[in-house]
Interface confidence: medium
């Protein structure tokens, strides 16, 4: 199955150009041909890059959206695709790169006074609008852009994993994205589930550390699907 690509999710200390996919180490990252991609859990060149399967945009990195790789392709087979830059054609906001949105089928620059990204709307629906506004306007983040003078420590807000110190990744938590520790052996990890299971992943974990993969906990095989725990285990 497509999910077999996700059998292992160990990536360690992504360099800044590759650090944008919070909690999604298998995500493709737009780059020039030949650059290393974090695909299939090991650094690979674009030639043998394995696409990251997805069911919805939220499973992809900040600079990606979820769609069938071929025009009019099988909707059941979707992967994370690079976002579309300004003036490129689009069908929904999530297709456009951060700082842009889809207007009349074209990606245009966000007017920060009247546009909020899809994810903000979704989170507002999930949690109710309790005298709340949701900060930030770029897609899939509830953070306004900031200059980071030092690497974020555990718990500090971030935009991408490269904002975080070594051993941490940038992952959604509550209504924000913060630096969280890369997971160690035995720690609970998250398997990406298909649509129809629990709702939007408001809370994300980092991926499992090097040499570890996210697998179902052995003593939970008898538990119902919805309550099964996955933990980081040695390959």
């Amino acid at each position: 199955t497509l999910n077999s690509v996700l059998n292992s999710n160990a990536i360690k200390n992504l360099p800044p150009p590759l650090g944008g996919a919070a909690g999604h180490p298998g995500s493709a990252v737009s780059a020039a041909p030949g650059i290393l991609y974090p695909g299939g859990n090991k650094y690979q060149t674009i030639d043998n890059y394995q696409p990251y399967p997805c069911a919805e945009d939220e499973e992809c990195g900040t600079d990606e959206y979820c769609a069938s790789p071929t025009r009019g392709g099988d909707a059941g087979v979707q992967i994370c695709l690079a976002c579309r830059k300004r003036r490129k054609r689009c069908m929904r906001h999530a297709m456009c790169c951060p700082g842009n949105y889809c207007k009349n089928g074209i990606c245009v620059s966000s007017d920060q006074n009247n546009f909020r990204g899809e994810i903000e709307e979704t989170i507002t629906e999930s949690f109710g609008n309790d005298h709340s506004t949701l900060d930030g306007y770029s897609r899939r983040t509830t953070l306004s852009s900031k200059m980071y003078h030092s690497k974020g420590q555990e718990g500090s807000v971030c935009l991408r994993s490269s904002d975080c110190a070594t051993g941490l990744c940038c992952a959604r938590h509550f209504w924000s994205k913060i630096c969280k520790p890369v997971l160690k052996e035995g720690q609970v990890c998250t398997k990406h589930r298909r649509k129809g299971s629990h709702g939007l992943e408001i809370f994300q974990r980092c991926y499992c550390g090097e040499g570890l993969s996210c697998r179902i906990q052995k003593d939970h095989h008898q538990a119902s699907n919805s309550s099964r725990l996955h933990t980081c285990q040695r390959h």
């Epitope: 005298h131 900060d135 420590q153 555990e154 718990g155 924000s176 609970v188 408001i202 919805s226």
Partner: antibody
Amino acid sequence: QVQLVESGGGLVQPGGSLRLSCAASGFTFSSYWMSWVRQAPGKGLEWVSVISSDSSSTYYADSVKGRFTISRDNSKNTLYLQMNSLRAEDTAVYYCARHGIDFDHWGQGTLVTVSS
Amino acid sequence: DIALTQPASVSGSPGQSITISCTGTSSDLGGYNYVSWYQQHPGKAPKLMIYDVNNRPSGVSNRFSGSKSGNTASLTISGLQAEDEADYYCQSYASGNTKVVFGGGTKLTVLG
């Protein structure tokens, strides 16, 4: 080290108002979400409110919605809780907590007593 | 409005292991694999002991461990010590209006 110090608690009559402050030090205050959590005497913990790092997002527990307002001043490294229309059931120790990976650091608390 | 259910008290002798349970619903604890545990000594502020079900913050003894199955989470303290005597609270996230929910707390008594 991370330090959170609450102040502003005291005795207030029902219907009255009070403003709590929480002075933060030892970390980059402007990079963290912050919360208020309260604990009635002899009772358990109850989450009250949370505010985003840049103040643009705020959430409240149903029990205080419309009466309490959370705010912060990042230039002063201070978190606030404005409490209006206070009720007897608001009597509690109020803690400010850094909302990093869950409530990873807490202040020592300040007691608010609502009584006539 | 206590959303998560904990036993009011548990006890154990020094050196023993004890487990504190925390039961919720599919709308909170069962729906998210995000459970935290806090220790609170009398007159003191709570201290984060476990987050994300079974992760220990730095500085917390490895005698403390967490787990979860279905709608129930557990905190296990092994090699019980006198200083472990305190109140313990579980916490989870929840869908709906209440964003953060706590358990009612469990008083741990270390005998002897």
